[in-house]
């Protein structure tokens, strides 16, 4: 199952069903309030907006120049399931699609399934993918966030997300861990780490750190419950922490931000 | 203006080595994966690499894995390729080219000719 | 590895009339995220490949609307509405499911 460092070439995205939940509208996250004052308030802010501007339909990526600062971790909790699944099949959903903590604290991604039959318990597996594109530098490059944001939502796959979409092969796969009954195992690149798998199917960090930025897939695979929609994922990030971040995320809070 | 400009191509004697270059303006090229992608004379398109935006991960075409290796400095906005072990069946025109979404290539280079010969 | 077959492989063509390629792949290009992962690209006389489509049926930025593309799984069409005596060039669909592959390629040129 581990599946650690360069992936094997093929398109392995959302699992089944689309990466965009009908009711898109409503995933959305929160609108953004302006609180700066100055320039540089008004770009970080300019910058905010980009990276969710895109809503939910556009990743995000870590920046190279974030590395040894404190941090803010984001999680964008994507949907990837429809309305309806067909008897005997699992559901899986993300739910919270906004999360803030600060880097070392914890964080937990949540992800629930229902099963239409339950004989026997399914086996929940946590996969890390990097990201296909830089989503932060993007956002701070307006050459870019205009060209290529505009022209995204302009070309008419508002629910296509390139910088979650993209072959294995130009990304890391890894498995994060796994559960069956209450026998958590973690992959091989985190043996160490104190993460494991809570109550339904959350993933749950005690500190977070700067490799952990990228796609975590909740999937939920059953031998009795072969259809319905068996995977769902979240994107995790992690921004430096600049003198612009208040102007960036107002409201933000220092310390962990309960669900 | 975006753009992406290849140099590097030359004649060169089988069995020997050479380097591509790709340097890429207009755009924030730390933000993209990229690709070489080749045509031999007369012929079509062949994909050959492709490396992610951070260079941590990349990918080959099974007739070059092994001698050509791809690579980037985000610094100086430039893509490589490093040819060895060079083969008559390798000669072509190179391009260097810009992933966007769907994993299409949007941006394209004006080429490069490599031909190998003795 | 997906093999891509474009038909045909040469296409004379009269200006302002219609034109179709087709491209068929070895195994489907739909992924589960309702996508299909199929290109399409014009590489003019002397001039570097250019994007026309993506994703199917997106047409790139600056592509005129007389090209589309359709289709799903297997079976794809390039069609040009009107053809332009600027549209002549070799045609070519490329998947992008698994690593990158291109078809033989259409020449289109005019009657």
């Known amino acids: 199952m581990q599946q650690d460092g360069l992936g094997v070439g093929t398109r392995n995205g959302s699992g089944k069903g689309r990466s965009v939940h009908p009711s898109w509208p409503w995933c959305a996250p929160r609108p953004l309030r302006y609180f700066g004052r100055d320039a540089r308030a008004r770009r970080a802010q300019t910058a905010a907006m980009a990276l969710l501007a895109g809503g939910l339909s556009r990743g995000l990526g870590s920046h190279p120049a974030a590395a040894g600062r404190d941090a803010v971790v984001f999680v964008w909790l994507l949907l990837s399931t429809w309305c309806t699944a067909p008897a005997r099949a699992i559901q899986v959903t993300v739910s919270n699609p906004y999360h803030v903590v600060i880097l070392f604290q914890p964080v937990t991604l949540p992800c629930t399934y229902q099963m239409t039959s339950t004989p026997t318990q399914p086996i929940v597996i946590w996969k890390y993918k990097s990201f296909c594109r830089d989503r932060i530098a993007d956002a701070f490059s307006p050459a870019s966030v205009d060209n290529q944001l505009n022209a995204q939502l302009a070309a008419g796959n508002p629910g296509y997300n390139p910088y979650v979409e993209c072959q294995d092969s130009v990304r890391t796969v890894r498995v994060v861990a796994t559960k069956q009954g209450n026998a958590v195992t973690l992959g091989d690149y985190y043996q160490g780490r104190r993460i494991t798998i809570t109550g339904n199917a959350d993933l749950t960090f005690d500190q977070t750190a700067w490799g952990d930025s990228g796609v975590y897939y909740c999937s939920v695979v059953s031998a009795q419950d072969l259809q319905g929609n068996n995977e769902a994922y979240a994107e995790l990030i992690v921004l430096g922490r600049t003198s612009g971040v208040a102007e960036l995320l107002p409201g933000f809070q220092a310390g962990p931000i309960e669900d | 203006q975006v753009q992406l400009v290849e140099s590097g191509g030359g004649l060169v004697k089988p069995g020997r080595s050479l380097r591509l270059s790709c340097a890429a303006s207009?755009?924030?090229?730390?933000?993209?994966?990229m690709h070489w992608v080749r045509q031999a004379p007369g012929k079509g398109l062949e994909w050959v690499a492709v490396i992610s935006y951070d260079g941590s991960n990349k990918h080959y075409a099974d007739s070059v894995k092994g001698r050509f290796t791809i690579s980037r400095d985000n610094s100086k906005n430039t893509l490589y390729l490093q040819m060895n072990s060079l083969r008559a069946e390798d000669t072509a025109v190179y391009y260097c080219a810009r992933d966007s979404p769907g994993n299409a290539f949007d941006i394209w280079g004006q080429g490069t000719m490599v031909t190998v010969s003795s | 590895d997906v093999v891509m077959t474009q038909s045909p492989l040469s296409l004379p063509v009269t200006p302002g009339e219609p034109a179709s390629i087709s491209c068929r792949s070895s195994?489907?290009?739909?992924?589960?995220?309702?996508?299909?992962?199929l290109d399409w690209y014009l590489q003019k006389p002397g001039q570097s490949p250019q994007l026309l489509i993506y994703?199917?049926?997106t047409r790139a930025s600056g592509v005129p609307d007389r090209f589309s593309g359709s289709g799903s799984g297997t079976d794809f069409t390039l069609k040009i509405s009107r053809v332009e005596a600027e549209d002549v060039g070799v045609y070519y669909c490329?998947?992008?499911?698994?690593?990158?592959?291109f078809g033989q390629g259409t020449k289109v040129e005019i009657k």
């Open positions: 195994q489907s290009l739909l992924h589960s995220n309702g996508y299909n992962y």
């Open positions: 994703l199917g049926s």
């Open positions: 490329m998947q992008a499911l698994q690593t990158w592959t």
């Open positions: 207009g755009f924030t090229f730390s933000s993209y994966a």
